[in-house]
Interface confidence: low
């Protein structure tokens, strides 16, 4: 049940040993009690004891004190359990009876006679404090006390709230005096079944199954699961979401492993040559006269720079050179002419203009030619017109720029982005390339758009040759070989003069 109405009988006085009908008991009134508890009635009526009833054995003769007894026959206080919400009001009828028969079960004996009865109607709140009362009539007096208490695991003003403390999968709590749940340390939620994670544990990226822990979801790390893990193979990059590889300043490429500022970082060009961040290796050295080699590390003969103009021939000397000038020219580099326009000195359709009253001349060259006599064809790539690492190529009278992946325009000045429409599935990172976007897939996914779920490591078999690095999750066949300098092919199996501008995708 949800609660118990308790009645403690304390003393009954019937000094003259009289019955309610005025007769006397012989030899004395052997007294037992009948208790009827029911719902509140303004006028008490006969009928069922809706809240319960109980009888006692014979407790004494005529006048007696009733002692407390916790078990067995004659238990005092009397217990009237109920299994409903206590309404706060009640009616109680206590009848004293005389029996000539059995002491222990007088209720069943014939010839029982009423001694007296009392009726109590009123309100009673649930609580541990006893309410004491005394009722008199002309012949008898009864002292008693009563209260209503909740049964174990029931709480509240009406014993209607069930709460049983627990510490298992379904909850971790104790019960408050009002029956509300009081979560054990480390637990929260309506039923105290949600653990409180480590303080500061990221709400989305971390979780816990028991208090004071923080387990990171895939792609996150750190004590509080608030640091993302960059893409596998990312060298000089960071992330703001898992599996990203956003390049640090000065680095480029799919894995941020291409040095866009090689000149500054490594100073590869020797002997005062000029370094530019372009070319197949990420840099190009422009040598001063007298030097050659990839890094201008090789000294040339003094004549290697062709210092003699106008067709003069050069002769090396110990620390210098000497120009032997053709007819009509003189000076250290044969730079001065003895010719005039009459000698038709301008080549390749150049126009001759007389100077110094006809004693010298100047050639106005057509497009694509230069030199004092228009004898040299213009190299349109000398001005490094291609931006963003584009390669310059002479094409007849003009030149074109061959752009690096991700760039376009006449001078490779425009950045193209196929990634704006977010083509990569499953959290893949998008990279703009010449032939469209390429997706870098998180662990466990592959395909052009990271749409294929993989269950094995495609690099485990070592598919890449010539020291190439293998990465998984970039294509339907699940791996990519990043070729070292001098090799190409899907598995870097072919040696070449120049590497491709982007790793071959297997």
């Amino acid at each position: 049940g949800s609660g118990i109405f308790q009645l403690r009988l304390q003393e009954f006085v019937n000094q003259r040993g009289m019955l309610a009908n005025g007769q006397s008991c012989e030899p004395g009134c052997r007294t037992f009690f009948r208790i009827c508890l029911k719902h509140f009635q303004a006028t008490f009526s006969e009928g069922p004891c809706t809240f319960g009833n109980v009888s006692t054995p014979v407790l004494g003769t005529n006048s007696f004190v009733v002692r407390d007894k916790n078990s067995g026959s004659g238990r005092n206080p009397l217990q009237l359990p109920f299994n409903f919400t206590w309404p706060g009001t009640f009616s109680l009828n206590i009848q004293a009876w005389h029996t000539p028969g059995d002491d222990l079960r007088p209720e069943t004996s014939p010839g029982n006679s009423l001694i007296s009865q009392i009726i109590i109607q009123g309100s009673l709140a649930v609580g541990k404090i006893w309410r004491t009362d005394e009722q008199n009539d002309t012949l008898t007096r009864l002292s008693y006390s009563y209260r209503v208490i909740c049964s174990d695991n029931y709480y509240g003003e009406s014993c209607s709230r069930l709460c049983k403390k627990r510490d298992d999968h379904f909850g971790h709590y104790e019960c408050q005096p009002d029956g509300s749940l009081s979560c054990l340390p480390g637990w929260t939620g309506k039923y105290c079944d949600q653990p409180i994670c480590l303080s500061g544990c990221h709400e989305q990226n971390g979780y816990c199954s028991k208090p004071d822990e923080c387990i990171c979801r895939p792609g996150w790390q750190g004590r509080l699961c608030n640091e993302c893990i960059p893409h596998n193979g990312c060298r000089h990059g960071t992330c703001s979401i898992p599996w990203q590889c956003a390049c640090d300043e000065g680095w480029g490429g799919l894995f941020c492993d291409q040095d866009l500022n090689y000149c500054t970082h490594h100073s590869p060009c020797k002997n005062g040559s000029t370094c530019s961040n372009s070319g197949p290796k990420g840099y190009t050295c422009t040598c001063l006269p007298g030097y050659t080699g990839e890094h201008c590390e090789l000294g040339l003969s003094k004549c290697a720079s062709n210092p003699c103009r106008n067709g003069g021939s050069c002769k090396d000397q110990e620390n210098s050179y000497h120009c032997l000038c053709p007819p009509g020219y003189y000076g250290q580099h044969c730079e001065h002419s003895t010719l005039t326009c009459a000698d038709s000195p301008c080549f390749n359709g150049g126009s001759c203009r007389e100077r110094n009253q006809g004693s010298s001349y100047a050639c106005e060259c057509p497009p694509n030619f230069t030199g004092s006599n228009c004898e040299k064809k213009v190299d349109r790539c000398t001005s490094n017109p291609c931006a963003n690492g584009g390669q310059c190529q002479n094409r007849g009278p003009s030149r074109t720029c061959r752009c690096r992946p991700g760039f376009t325009g006449t001078h490779c000045e425009l950045h193209i982005s196929d990634c704006a429409r977010s083509p990569c599935a499953h959290g893949g990172t998008c990279h703009d390339l010449e032939n469209g976007p390429v997706c870098t897939c998180p662990a466990g996914f592959s395909g052009r758009r990271c749409e294929v779920r993989i269950t094995h490591d495609a690099c485990a078999s070592g598919p890449c040759f010539n020291g190439a690095t293998c990465y998984t999750g970039l294509s339907p066949n699940n791996f990519v070989c990043n070729c070292p300098y001098g090799f190409v092919g899907s598995r870097c199996e072919f040696p070449v003069g120049l590497p491709p501008s982007f790793p071959w995708v297997a």
Epitope: T85, G156, S158, S160, K190
Partner: nanobody
Framework: EVQLVESGGGLVQPGGSLRLSCAAS????????MSWVRQAPGKGPEWVSA????????YYADSVKGRFTISRDNAKNTLYLQMNSLKPEDTAVYYC????????????????WGQGTQVTVSS
Amino acid sequence: EVQLVESGGGLVQPGGSLRLSCAASGFTFGNYDMSWVRQAPGKGPEWVSAINSGGGDTYYADSVKGRFTISRDNAKNTLYLQMNSLKPEDTAVYYCATPRGWGPTGPHEYGYWGQGTQVTVSS
């Protein structure tokens, strides 16, 4: 003395709207979860809606979800129930009460009750 006094009931046609109010006194209203309970003629009490003490969490019986909205103003010690798209089966006496016990779907035991306000939906 704790008092919950409902108002705003009345006769309304199907599809119509009503707004019930419950003025609370005698206890710290803002500390208590509150609920609306209704009792149709000849039937037992039916939980309608509940709201937590701060007003951030609301709960609805399936029969009224999407049509009724519970809210509260702790500064005014008042609970509200906005009832839209009313149906004849919404006819009942509506009580506001403090939930004391929760079942799987909502409150099933209550502490303090109001005296109720009659809502009749009929054409």
